[in-house]
Amino acid sequence: GSGIFQLRLQEFVNQRGMLANGQSCEPGCRTFFRICLKHFQATFSEGPCTFGNVSTPVLGTNSFVVRDKNSGSGRNPLQLPFNFTWPGTFSLNIQAWHTPGDDLRPETSPGNSLISQIIIQGSLAVGKIWRTDEQNDTLTRLSYSYRVICSDNYYGESCSRLCKKRDDHFGHYECQPDGSLSCLPGWTGKYCDQPICLSGCHEQNGYCSKPDECICRPGWQGRLCNECIPHNGCRHGTCSIPWQCACDEGWGGLFCDQDLNYCTHHSPCKNGSTCSNSGPKGYTCTCLPGYTGEHCELGLSKCASNPCRNGGSCKDQENSYHCLCPPGYYGQHCEHSTLTCADSPCFNGGSCRERNQGSSYACECPPNFTGSNCEKKVDRCTSNPCANGGQCQNRGPSRTCRCRPGFTGTHCELHISDCARSPCAHGGTCHDLENGPVCTCPAGFSGRRCEVRITHDACASGPCFNGATCYTGLSPNNFVCNCPYGFVGSRCEFPVGLPPSFPWVA
């Protein structure tokens, strides 16, 4: 049923042991009760007990107190279960009877006699609180209390709301006092049958079948299914949608496995040198002072930067250098002088000039003398100033370099290039090769020096693909495609590094 009407009999008083008809019971009134519960009637009438009825065994003789009893015969409070929405109103008839017969089943005995009866009509809300009452007539008194409570799994003001807690495929919830569902932790939805996925799990790309789970849909990965899975074999690329392979900066090819930026990815240049993505190996290192080698891996002397001043000599040490100062100078770089102009430090007629508010000095030397104190006679060729085998010649206060053929410049440091004469006409690009200069001609020109104007421009049709540069006059076909990095073929039509399934890969 959906609820139970409970009636607790507490005390019955029939001191004179009288029946309703005025006769007395012999030897005393052996009393049992009949209870009839029905729908509310303004005037109680005979007829079926629509809400239920119940009888008790003999509970006592004449006057007695009724004890609570939870089970078996003579249970108290009496239970009147019902299986409908409690209407909130009722009629109750309690009859006290005397039986000469069986104690346990007096209802069936012949010769039962009515002692007294009471009728209650009214309203009663569902609740745990007992309503206590007492009814008297001329001969008897009955004390009792009653209430209506909902059966297990029924809730609400009229016990009409069925709720049975569960934790299975059909739901995961407990029941609130009003019968509404209270989802167990990790579950949601009207019937608490939808799991709450791991916090942050992507709404579209992830799902779960139990709480705190995040199962990724195809093409997605990561704890929260918010990272796309790139194309299988994608080496140096990313995706914004599944199965993409968008190359990282400096990488190319279908699978982003072609290194277009050797500098960034391999850092071949050491010791703070600058790397540029050019040259025969795909990169060139420009060394900082003090370093040399293809990768600037070889440390020149720490003294290469000439840190010692005032004629100090430099000595390499493990991670640094040490300046051995000439007499009269001191400090880490021989930058401080012991003497001032007042000590007449300049030789050979040198004139002394004070520096740093008189704390140091500088000697201005006459011609042909040098050194911080004008102590050295000048030989302008001792430093071998002429490069590339040039001959040094002292010419009074100056010197000149006589250069070998093919070289020029004050120190013979400049190579005279075949291209220096600009042999290429019409804006052609000159390349110095061992056998002489070669011209690469712009579109519309050909010939060894780009001197021939082509009436039919082979590059005009745009025969080169993938951003390649078209040149004419270098081949019998009248054009050559200079491919950008990452493409090959006579027209630069094939990407490098295609998978073997492509027919043009050997």
Partner: nanobody, 119 residues
Framework: EVQLVESGGGLVQAGGSLRLSCAAS????????MGWYRQAPGKQRELVAT??????TRYADSAKGRFTISRDNAKTVSLQMDNLKPEDTGVYYC??????????????WGQGTQVTVSS
């Protein structure tokens, strides 16, 4: 040839004082300056203090305010060292800056005197 002889080194407690003296002898050309260098164990020789003929004094940063250099005459120099610290420990070399016939400047050095400052 110039000879330089130092004296006054020794062991002293931190906070104590020492006075170093140096005298030049021999075939003395023009001396332009005299002074003291220190060489701590495992380190390079570094200037402590120097004074020129024109009375120009120079001090290392670590010596300023604690050490005083003075030329008693053209051939002698003294270094008064007060409030000594353990980091002042080392061999103290007297030097003189003099001219040669060439002409150029040259340093002449003494044998050195040990100064040890204990903490």
């Amino acid at each position: 040839e110039v000879q330089l002889v130092e004296s006054g080194g020794g062991l002293v407690q931190a906070g104590g004082s020492l006075r170093l003296s140096c005298a030049a002898s021999g075939d003395i050309p023009r001396i332009a300056a005299m002074g003291w260098y220190r060489q701590a164990p495992g380190k390079q020789r570094e200037l402590v203090a120097t004074v020129s003929n024109a009375a120009t004094t120079r001090y290392a940063d670590s010596a300023k305010g604690r050490f005083t250099i003075s030329r008693d005459n053209a051939k002698t120099v003294s270094l008064q060292m007060d409030n000594l610290k353990p980091e002042d420990t080392g061999v103290y070399y007297c030097y003189s800056l003099a001219t040669t016939v060439t002409p150029s400047w040259v340093n002449y050095w003494g044998q050195g005197t040990q100064v040890t400052v204990s903490s």
